[in-house]
């Protein structure tokens, strides 16, 4: 062991640049710090074979496999991958260690496998083996967290059955409404599964892993708050756990809380109470109603009553499978060029949806906001006044929903013209869709007022890229107009635009654009 060189194998991850092939070099890229791969002499091997930890990377990731050799004198090397030899250029670092690198750019299935590095130094020969595979992310899942009571303790456990195992955090807020937004200073995050402080105003549990982040809010009725105009509604699927928290504050301890389902008291074992004194010596009581696995007959009005507060209710609806309720009829909008406007979709869904807004094959993040009436809303304002088709797509574990929107921007036509030997064509994408006139310019009509009606053909076509309509008009060439200047004009309620074309022989035409408002 003592006469062998000290070998260090590392993996360097790169933030991807657009490239595609493996290179045996030091390639300029933004890199993370090297990760040790625990290179060690492979047991029972014939010859000196070092092996690095098995490497597993995402598709399209870029990495460098690197070996640092602490051995005196020069080294020569050769990479072998799938029986092909790859060029190898060792260099020396500041500590005079030999450095050999293999860059794999944009990892693909064909680049997975065993990479062998043969090194020859003045003292000895040895081989280093790297095994590189593609991570199977198809097995990854991220499930919405749910609550369980901790055995023998007044505490809630947050559970998310996800792969890879998620980081679970409680997100707590003690103020009302807008100030409980995720990044607000009023929000406190606790990265732990068990929560003992259950008296806060707003309690959520979130789970995050490589697939993203999912959260569940602890459904709460606050008897000190004015009830919502519409009855709060909670949806659950058969088999899911039900948790409702009833909270009340009073000047002293002389009050009690009870839960009823459809006017019948909840059975023992389906509720538990906690109480504490707040800073101003008032008493806070909370009473949890819970069912570890709901059935259809757990549907109904759950009412929390207090001897000192008006009672409040929530409607719990148990469904067999999830749903997304919204109107899917397509909607058309026309707006002015600088008018502020947002698309919006109002929906009721359970479980919570994942959604995207799409325009011209590009997806945009989708935000949803809960409304007081049990509905949610998603708005999209980032259209940058580009006309065309916008698509809202939503899905949850059980349902999918798609809604189409068309956005038209009111504007004066802009005319483009082209001509061939047999015809002249003009195009415009103004809105409302323009009407067309063709005029002939001649000695008799130097101002081009002589209208052409023969041989004109108008049509509207969908420009596929944005889903926006383009109107065109084509004039078939006749002997009567050959050699003359003609003018095509597009007009709508916002103005007129014209283009003048010289009709002579095929080839590039000089176009003169007239803008007439």
């Amino acid at each position: 062991n003592q006469d062998l060189p000290v070998i260090k194998c590392v993996l360097i991850n790169h933030k991807n640049n657009d490239s595609s092939v493996g290179k045996s070099s030091s390639y300029p890229m933004v890199s993370e710090s090297p990760e040790d791969l625990g290179c060690a002499l492979r047991p029972q091997s014939s010859g000196t074979v070092y092996e690095a930890a098995a490497v597993e990377v995402d598709v399209s990731a870029s990495i460098t496999l690197q070996v640092l050799v602490d051995a005196p004198g020069n080294i020569s090397c050769l990479w072998v991958f799938k029986h092909s030899s790859l060029n190898c250029q060792p260099h020396f670092d500041l500590q005079n260690r030999g450095v050999v690198s293999m860059v794999i750019l944009k990892m693909t299935e064909t680049q997975a496998g065993e990479y062998l590095l043969f090194i020859q130094s003045e003292a000895t020969n040895y081989t280093i083996l790297f095994t590189v595979s593609i991570r199977n992310t198809l097995l990854y899942t991220l499930r919405r967290p749910y609550f369980r009571k901790m055995e023998n303790q007044d505490a809630l456990v947050c559970i998310s059955e996800s792969v890879p195992e998620p980081i679970v955090e409680w997100v707590l807020c003690d103020s009302q409404g807008e100030s409980c937004k995720e990044e607000s200073p009023a929000v406190v995050k606790k990265e732990e599964k068990v929560l003992h402080e259950l008296f806060g105003t707003d309690i959520r549990c979130c789970a995050r892993n490589e697939l993203g982040r999912e959260c569940t809010r602890l459904f709460t009725i606050d008897l000190n708050q004015t009830p919502q105009t519409t009855l709060p509604q909670l949806f659950l699927k058969v088999g899911e756990p039900l948790w409702i928290r009833c909270k009340a504050v009073h000047v002293n301890h002389g009050f009690g809380l009870t839960w009823e389902l459809e006017n019948k008291a909840l059975e023992e074992g389906n509720y538990f109470e906690m109480s504490t004194y707040s800073t101003n010596r008032t008493m806070i009581r909370i009473l949890f109603a819970f069912v570890s696995s709901v059935a259809r007959n757990d549907t109904g009005y759950y009412t929390c009553s207090s001897s000192k507060h008006p009672s409040q209710s929530a409607l719990v609806t148990i469904v067999e499978k999830g749903f997304i309720n919204a109107t899917n009829s397509s909607e058309d909008y026309e707006i002015d060029q600088y008018e502020e406007f947002c698309f919006s979709v109002r929906f009721k869904a359970y479980p919570q949806i994942r959604c995207t807004w799409t325009f011209s094959r590009k997806s945009f993040p989708c935000e949803q906001k809960g409304l007081d009436n049990g509905y949610s809303i998603s708005k999209f304002c980032n259209h940058k006044h580009q006309p065309g088709e916008y698509i809202f797509h939503a899905e949850n574990d059980d349902a999918q929903f798609t809604k189409m929107f068309t956005l038209n921007i009111r504007r004066k036509p802009q005319v483009l013209a082209e001509a061939s030997a047999s015809q002249a064509s003009c195009f415009s994408d103004g809105y409302p869709l323009p009407s067309w006139t063709w005029k002939k310019c001649s000695d008799k009509s130097p101002n081009c007022t002589e209208e052409i009606t023969e041989g004109v053909w108008n049509r509207k076509a969908n420009r596929k890229v944005f889903g926006q309509w383009v109107s065109s008009s084509t004039l078939n060439m006749s002997e009567a107009i050959k050699g003359f200047l003609v003018k095509c004009c597009a007009y709508n309620s916002l103005g007129t635009s014209c283009e003048t074309i010289l009709l002579n022989s095929p080839g590039p035409f000089p176009f003169i654009q007239d803008n007439i408002s």
Partner: antibody, heavy 124, light 112 residues
Framework: QVTLKESGPALVKPTQTLTLTCTFS??????????VSWIRQPPGKALEWLAH???????SYSTSLKSRLTISKDTSKRQVVLTMTNMDPVDTATYYC????????????????WGQGTLVTVSS | DIVMTQTPLSLSVTPGQPASISCRSS???????????LYWYLQKPGQPPQLLIY???NRFSGVPDRFSGSGSGTDFTLKISRVEAEDVGVYYC?????????FGGGTKVEIK
């Protein structure tokens, strides 16, 4: 340079839950077949393996302590957390975290690097 | 669980002399892939353990060649050809064939 460092309370009361964090550097639990184990050693006694977690999220626990242990990782923070419920004076020990490496050809270098250990005393 | 039994419990050796520690497992540590999942560690006073030998007979990086391991199946031996003062401490064997991983009770080596 591979390093591991254990952190957590030095004193825990009986029945309480112990949470220990192993913060490591020089390697990661994301792209290589690596793992982190927790091992403890009561004063003057032998080593006892508690739990391990691998980069692919595979976990194992000591048979006798399984019901009390939970191991988890935060790849981005380069941390592995061990929680042990219902602590008892017999759990007084130095708790170590150590790295293990898995190789493509099916062998393992177990515990090639260790933390310095953190002494946890369980007493009322 | 696999039980690991180490003998002797302690060993007092003259510097330059050889030393041998035995480790027996309650079941074979030979995996179907041909590897024996047996490891040796040395814990010097006041330090965490350090890996000496992996997969029965492979010296870990930086471990002097006076340390050697041998054996197969259920019987394994760690030998120190010439004990030096820096070799004092407790030696542990460990199996990793299956979880839970288990350690031997340790052998304390001291210098005469």
């Amino acid at each position: 340079q591979v390093t591991l460092k254990e952190s957590g309370p030095a004193l825990v009361k009986p029945t309480q839950t112990l949470t220990l964090t192993c913060t490591f550097s020089g390697f990661s639990l994301s792209n290589a077949r690596m793992g982190v184990s927790w091992i403890r050693q009561p004063p003057g006694k032998a080593l006892e393996w508690l739990a391990h977690i691998f980069s692919n999220d595979e976990k194992s626990y000591s048979t006798s302590l399984k019901s009390r242990l939970t191991i988890s990782k935060d790849t981005s923070k380069r941390q592995v957390v061990l929680t042990m419920t219902n602590m008892d004076p017999v759990d007084t020990a130095t708790y170590y975290c150590a790295r293990m490496v898995g190789y493509g050809s099916g062998w393992y270098a177990y515990f090639d690097y260790w933390g310095q250990g953190t002494l946890v005393t369980v007493s009322s | 669980d696999i039980v690991m039994t180490q003998t002797p419990l302690s060993l007092s050796v003259t510097p330059g002399q050889p030393a041998s520690i035995s480790c027996r497992s309650s079941q074979s540590l030979l995996h179907s892939n041909g590897y024996n999942y047996l490891y040796w560690y040395l814990q010097k006073p006041g330090q965490p353990p350090q890996l000496l030998i992996y997969e029965v007979s492979n010296r870990f990086s930086g471990v002097p060649d006076r340390f050697s391991g041998s054996g197969s199946g259920t019987d394994f031996t760690l030998k120190i050809s010439r004990v030096e003062a820096e070799d004092v401490g407790v030696y542990y064997c460990m199996q990793a064939l299956q979880t839970p991983l288990t350690f031997g009770g340790g052998t304390k080596v001291e210098i005469k």
